[in-house]
């Protein structure tokens, strides 16, 4: 579409503007420019016929216009009256018309403004200040900046006189700022130098710091007074109404209870003539007592008992605080505080609730901490674990079993073999074992405080012959390029070497194969379809060796990009079309066909008898594997020609 772009849109007087033509059609007869929004012969600026290269000035031609071969119009030495719309009328070679309208605006250049003020030292909450931006300029926009920010919205700020005057009513100290005015029109912007408004204010009610009013006997009292004021305030101190000194700070070392009383700071502003005072009451205390914790249950049982911890002593108007493990109390439904925070109750204690616990008393001066208290939570025994984990031993070796169960107090242990009590020790040792030492080994753990007992049974086999191993797997149907598989050779046997074979060969070197757990575990990372082989593990010691039955890994993969056969793409009319689709996949994929995007049958083979040119198009085979969740497809273009029209065409099936 033919368009006109004015460069620039806003033009300074005396400068030039280019009415730039975009998308000028090819093959032109000529073009003509007009002042205004339409084609009007009385307002024609200039016409140009390409064939004759003839430019004809019109009634609106001023001598400042230059027309270019690309139809763009340059207007020089711009005057105010040039503002407005301009229309380009284009006639194409076939005498078809097109027109487009553009516009620009003309503005004068602006001088640098300045600010005049009617009050150089206004008093807060009393005076008003009027700033005026000079000079007054026609067709200019006036803007104001406070600390280089645009004007805030405020009922005390009023713009008038076409925004040329900024009035601040009832000035405040916050109006002490850098003020600038700016004059703008679309072709220039000028900003004044800044004017700083100096507002006299205060003094405000002084603040005495620090804020705390309670002190311990023997400390130093160091009070500082400050009142917001311009110019800065002069300060005086009074204690119980008696003048002390004319300074901003008051210092009394090594105070006693006798220094308790009212402390007054007076601030004075000599320019505004105002005085303000603030009084603080100081109390000097003797040392408070150190807190301690009492408990209603010194040996609570896990998951059964509750414990109430109380912070002593009880003091009126005191804040009690608690810490667990040197942290503030966590949020937990098992932790409850009394209304006065003095008692902390732990509901249904666990072994993790041992602490330490601390309480604190907060007074006006500080926080005093108790000594830490640790809870003795009785728990267990948990299910015992027997180590080592071997279940097969050779005759003649020593059998050394150890039992452990988490318990407080520590558990008492008993060993039983085939149900017969052996000894009351944590460890069981039998030297030079024989096949007769095979059997069920039971460890029993007992907690005398809770009265609870737990047992674990382990089957020990003593045999010169190693058993036939078996392979366990953590994933029976891994997906290609996604899953890992870990094979473990069972059982775990002492002094035994574990070996692995793949398809009857020793393990190949591969970064995807990793042995661990003393070679007992073989992990295949990122399985591929080539990993679908027979895996065998073997165990051996110095007297025997044995191999597992093979385990074949069933790797799910595909579907790969299908192949459509036969490969022919051109057929003669009347032939039979018999397309077969195949994709490598495990399990076998589901097949479906689409012709020109329209679904057909869900078969591996697509058969169409006696095809015609109507059967031209795209034949797509889609394959999906429900097990891997993956899909694939291929598209084949088939061209059917009328019989005998083109050589080299397939006759079909």
């Amino acid at each position: 579409k033919l368009t006109i772009e004015s460069t620039p849109f806003n033009v300074a007087e005396g400068k030039e503007v280019l009415l730039l033509v975009h998308n000028l059609p090819q093959h032109l007869f000529g073009y003509s420019w007009y002042k205004g929004e339409r084609v009007d012969g009385n307002r024609q600026i200039i016409g140009y016929v390409i064939g004759t290269q003839q430019a004809t000035p019109g009634p609106a031609y001023s001598g400042r216009e230059i027309i270019y071969p690309n139809a763009s119009l340059l207007i020089q030495n711009i005057i105010q009256n040039d503002t407005g719309f301009y229309t380009l009328h284009v006639i194409k070679s076939d005498l078809v018309n097109e027109e487009a309208t553009g516009q620009f605006r003309v503005y004068p250049e602006l001088p640098k403004p300045s600010i005049s003020s009617n009050n150089s030292k206004p008093v807060e909450d009393k005076d008003a200040v009027a700033f005026t931006c000079e000079p007054e300029t026609q067709d200019a926009t006036y803007l104001w900046w406070v600390n280089n920010q645009s004007l805030p919205v405020s009922p005390r700020l009023q713009l008038s006189n076409g925004n040329r005057t900024l009035t601040l009513f009832n000035v405040t100290r916050n109006d002490t700022a850098s003020y600038k005015c700016e004059t703008q029109n679309p072709v220039s912007a000028r900003r004044s130098d800044s004017v700083i408004l100096n507002v006299l204010y205060g003094p405000d009610a002084p603040t005495i710091s620090p804020l705390n009013t309670s002190y311990r006997s023997g400390e130093n009292l160091n009070l500082s007074c400050h009142a917001a004021s311009n110019p800065p305030a002069q300060y005086s101190w009074f204690v119980n109404g008696t003048f002390q000194q004319s300074t901003q700070e008051l210092f009394i070392p090594n105070i006693t209870v006798n220094n308790s009383g009212s402390y007054t700071c007076q601030a004075h502003n000599s320019d505004t003539g105002l005085n303000r005072t603030t009084v603080t009451t100081i109390t000097v205390y003797a040392e408070p007592p150190k807190p301690f914790i009492t408990s209603n249950n010194s040996n609570p049982v896990e998951d059964e008992d509750a414990v109430a911890l109380t912070c002593e002593p009880e003091i009126q108007n005191t804040t009690y605080l608690w810490w667990v493990n040197n942290q503030s109390l966590p949020v937990s439904p098992r932790l409850q505080l009394s209304n006065d925070n003095r008692t902390l109750t732990l509901l249904s204690v666990t072994r993790n609730d041992v602490g330490p616990y601390e309480c604190g008393i907060q007074n006006e001066l500080s926080v005093d901490h108790s000594d830490p208290v640790i809870l003795n939570v009785l728990y267990g025994p948990d299910d015992p674990t027997i180590s080592p984990s071997y279940t097969y031993y050779r005759p003649g070796v020593n059998l050394s079993l150890s039992c452990h169960a988490a318990s407080n107090p520590p558990a008492q242990y008993s060993w039983l073999i085939d149900g017969n009590i052996q000894q009351h020790t944590q460890e069981l040792f039998i030297s030079n074992i024989t096949e007769k030492n095979s059997g069920l080994y039971t460890c029993q753990a007992n907690n005398s405080a809770s009265g609870h007992s737990r047992t674990t049974v382990k089957t020990i086999t003593v045999s010169a012959e190693l058993p036939k191993p078996s392979i366990s797997s953590n994933n029976s149907k891994p997906v290609e390029d996604k899953d890992a598989v870990a094979f473990t050779c069972e059982p775990e046997a002492q002094n035994t070497t574990y070996l692995w074979w793949v398809n009857g060969q020793s393990l190949p070197v591969s970064p995807r194969l990793q042995l661990s757990n003393g070679n007992r575990t073989l992990t295949l990372f990122n399985v591929t379809r080539n990993d679908a082989r027979a895996y065998v593990c073997g165990i051996q010691n110095s007297v025997s060796a044995n191999r597992s039955d093979p385990v074949t890994l069933d790797v799910l993969y595909g579907p790969d990009t299908p192949i459509i056969s036969p490969p022919d793409s051109s057929y003669l009319s009347g032939a039979n079309l018999n397309l077969s689709c195949h994709s490598a996949s495990n399990p076998s994929p589901q097949y479906s066909w689409r012709i020109n995007g329209i679904p057909q049958q869900h078969t591996q083979v697509l058969f169409i008898a006696k095809i015609t040119p109507n059967n031209n198009g795209t034949y797509a085979c889609f394959v999906s594997n429900l097990a891997t969740g993956r899909n694939n497809s291929i598209v084949k273009s088939i061209t059917v020609s009328a019989s005998g029209t083109s050589p080299g065409l397939s006759a079909g099936a």
Partner: antibody, heavy 121, light 106 residues
Framework: EVQLLESGGGLVQPGGSLRLSCAAS????????MGWVRQAPGKGLEWVSS????????SYADSVKGRFTISRDNSKNTLYLQMNSLRAEDTAVYYC??????????????WGQGTLVTVSS | DIQMTQSPSSLSASVGDRVTITCRAS??????LNWYQQKPGKAPKLLIY???SLQSGVPSRFSGSGSGTDFTLTISSLQPEDFATYYC????????FGQGTKLEIK
Amino acid sequence: EVQLLESGGGLVQPGGSLRLSCAASGFTFSSSYMGWVRQAPGKGLEWVSSIGSGSYSTSYADSVKGRFTISRDNSKNTLYLQMNSLRAEDTAVYYCARYPPVPFPPHLDYWGQGTLVTVSS
Amino acid sequence: DIQMTQSPSSLSASVGDRVTITCRASQSISSYLNWYQQKPGKAPKLLIYAASSLQSGVPSRFSGSGSGTDFTLTISSLQPEDFATYYCQQAGNPHTFGQGTKLEIK
């Protein structure tokens, strides 16, 4: 003085052909766009065709497109209209007309006196 | 194609009358409108081009106005030689004419 003189009109049977000529003088013919306009007996004006100064650009009314061909010979200052497959509804006075050197927008400022074409069996 | 409709199709007036003929386009044609005068047995004569521009040599009593779809030809004071048929023509594509307005002596 601009002058345009048409010739070649006459009686022709339906399906027949006719070639109209327009001799131009009094202006620079080679740089002017030219056109044909017709007027059926007792009817209004109908624009027929136009041609650019160098013969490169031609336009036709839908009613004659494919049957009529406009052409020019700048060396002879002559405009032509070849009319084939004539029909009874092509019966009209055919005017040759000039587009001015600076035609913004396109308009016909000089016309010939016309030549009558009658299509009848 | 753009259709041009003139109204009225015929008009009776007296010498000295002010006469207005209107032309309406079926879609906007900007200011691309021309007016022609044709007397019986004669070739058409250009009066107004670009809706309002008076062709050189045409009396100033003829004037044109309008843009977009509605246009007007005005004869401010009818003279005896002005009785003729008037055609509007759009200069878009193709350059179709209106059906004409016949101005007769009352």
